[in-house]
Interface confidence: low
Amino acid sequence: YHGCPSECTCSRASQVECTGARIVAVPTPLPWNAMSLQILNTHITELNESPFLNISALIALRIEKNELSRITPGAFRNLGSLRYLSLANNKLQVLPIGLFQGLDSLESLLLSSNQLLQIQPAHFSQCSNLKELQLHGNHLEYIPDGAFDHLVGLTKLNLGKNSLTHISPRVFQHLGNLQVLRLYENRLTDIPMGTFDGLVNLQELALQQNQIGLLSPGLFHNNHNLQRLYLSNNHISQLPPSVFMQLPQLNRLTLFGNSLKELSPGIFGPMPNLRELWLYDNHISSLPDNVFSNLRQLQVLILSRNQISFISPGAFNGLTELRELSLHTNALQDLDGNVFRMLANLQNISLQNNRLRQLPGNIFANVNGLMAIQLQNNQLENLPLGIFDHLGKLCELRLYDNPWRCDSDILPLRNWLLLNQPRLGTDTVPVCFSPANVRGQSLIIINVNVAVPSVHVPEVPSYPETPWYPDTPSYPDTTSVSSTTELTSPVEDYTDLTTIQVTDDRSVWGMTQAQSG
């Protein structure tokens, strides 16, 4: 098949692959009918004039993971059929003007993971058919006005992981077909009003891991097709009242890792499609009535690791489709009995690592589908009679690391726990904290006769009586907090991966799906 360089492999499908450290220049002669050429992991440092002159049928050219630092302006001459060009993972600092001239069919241009210091309007002025431009992982400090003006067909632009400190409001104005814009991991402190106004078809906007302190009220008002908005790990301390008002298609919004102190009613929405709202690691202290009431399709609400001490009874109004509610690691002391009343489809709730002293008997009254409840590491001494009776699907209940008061009032709870031991898991069981003579003993098998009797007459338990168990040897109370944690780590180079990870067998509330961007 028309000759294949010895350092390359050539398939009958006109695909050529050249790899290896011994390659220091573009191999020759390349088969004239090659349609795909990959030059990977070589020691090529420069591309000279027209090394691909005789393979004009080439459609895809990948020159990746090399030592490439210099390219002659005419390097890609005669590649008029080229649709895909990747120069990613090289050592390019400068692109010569006119490098992409004549590449009239080019649709994808990957320049990511180089050391580019600047781009100019003239670089891409000939690339009128370009649909994808990847510039992430470079050293760009600013984007000049006009840089993308000729790329009217562009649908995906990645500028993440650069050193951008500001963006001109005009730089994206001609990109009316853009669907994905990624600006994550830069040094942006604010985004001027109007920056995204021309992006009427935008579906994903990634702004996470910048230093944005303030969002302009109308920043997203023209982006009616936006589906994913990543604002996590910035310095946002407040949300303007109308900032999310015109996002009817949004289905994922990440705001974790900011400095939000309060959420005002109506701030979210109306967003008929929003499925996930990530708000952990902020400074939120209270949740007012109706704060999420516009989010009728919300399924995942993560509010953990804030400073929430008060939740208004109507805070979760409207969240009829919510499946997962994470409130762990906050400062809750009390909960209103009606606070979860509207959450008819809730399956998992995490309330661990708070300061809850008691729970109202009707707290889970309407939430019949609950499968997992995390209540460990609170200040609970007892629980109301029958609090879990109606929860037929409950398969996971964590109650350890609470100061259970094992007097005769604890009997109904102890009997219920005895019958439902599998739901408690085998790792850590709840133990008595008081009276002193039973401290450290398992709540489930404690002999309540040994404990100090309560002054009140206990109610008749609604659970069947269970046999008494003799005393068991005391063992130290384990006070280590084994809390559910949300970890964030990048997936590929543009993602908010938000995995709620579990440290024991709490896999149901482990939110096994990775929330990736």
Epitope: G218, H221, M245, Q246, P248, P270, P272, R296
Partner: antibody, heavy 119, light 111 residues
């Protein structure tokens, strides 16, 4: 009680423009959305576009894009709909309607303005 | 042609129940719980009867109820009365170029 009062009937020549007003009273004007819906004689309802005065950015149905302009004046609690390049098939009753949000439902309607396009 | 499909007419006798259907796609009716129903008497502006599939605004009789299954929404009027005779329109939020789509309307005749 919320009320939407529209301007009076208009007769226009083909190719000209018409501007219909809708004055709101009895509620917060800025934070609600005003939509414009038209109804040709003997026909159904057709959404043209909407605006939330607080934001100022209108949204238009694709069919009317480029021909309709919707604006709002917060100081007078009045919304406007201007339709240009009129043709005979634009003869219709034009309603303004208020909703919590232009995507959802319209709980208050104006009385309607008949626009007749005839040469 | 309207984006949502309704029967052109339905009829019923006083006291009876009738149902008007409204069929769309997964981009409108099927995709969201944002279906509304309006009643319109001749020469009058439409009046909101049902919003968000099944909610009734205050002042609307509980004889009017709404539901949805898949891509089809329905309006049911029980205990038909003479004043129910009117045109009825369904409307949905739409994941398309138009944010709002209406049905073609159904003329209800009370016999």
């Amino acid at each position: 009680q919320v009320q939407l009062v529209q301007s009076g009937a208009e007769v226009k020549k083909p190719g000209s423009s018409v501007k219909v007003s809708c004055k709101a009273s009895g509620g917060t004007f800025s934070t609600y959305a005003i939509s414009w819906v038209r109804q040709a004689p003997g026909q159904g309802l057709e959404w043209m576009g909407g605006i939330t005065p607080m934001f100022g950015t209108p949204n238009y149905a694709q069919k009317f894009q480029g021909r309709v302009t919707i604006t709002a004046d917060e100081s007078t609690s009045t919304a406007y709909m201007e339709l240009s390049s009129l043709r005979s098939e634009d003869t219709a009753v034009y309603y303004c309607a208020r909703g919590d949000w232009y995507d959802y439902h319209f709980d208050y309607w104006g009385q309607g303005t008949l626009v007749t396009v005839s040469s | 042609q309207s984006a949502l499909t309704q029967p052109a007419s339905v009829s019923g006798s006083p006291g009876q129940s009738i149902t008007i259907s409204c069929t769309g796609t997964s981009s409108d009716v099927g995709g969201y719980n944002y279906v509304s129903w309006y009643q319109q008497h001749p020469g009058k502006a439409p009046k909101l009867m049902i919003y968000e599939v099944s909610n009734r605004p205050s002042g609307v009789s509980n004889r009017f109820s709404g539901s949805k299954s898949g891509n089809t929404a329905s309006l049911t009027i029980s205990g038909l009365q003479a004043e129910d005779e009117a045109d009825y329109y369904c409307q949905s939020y739409a994941n398309r170029d138009n944010f709002v789509v209406f049905g073609g309307g159904t003329k209800l005749t009370v016999l």
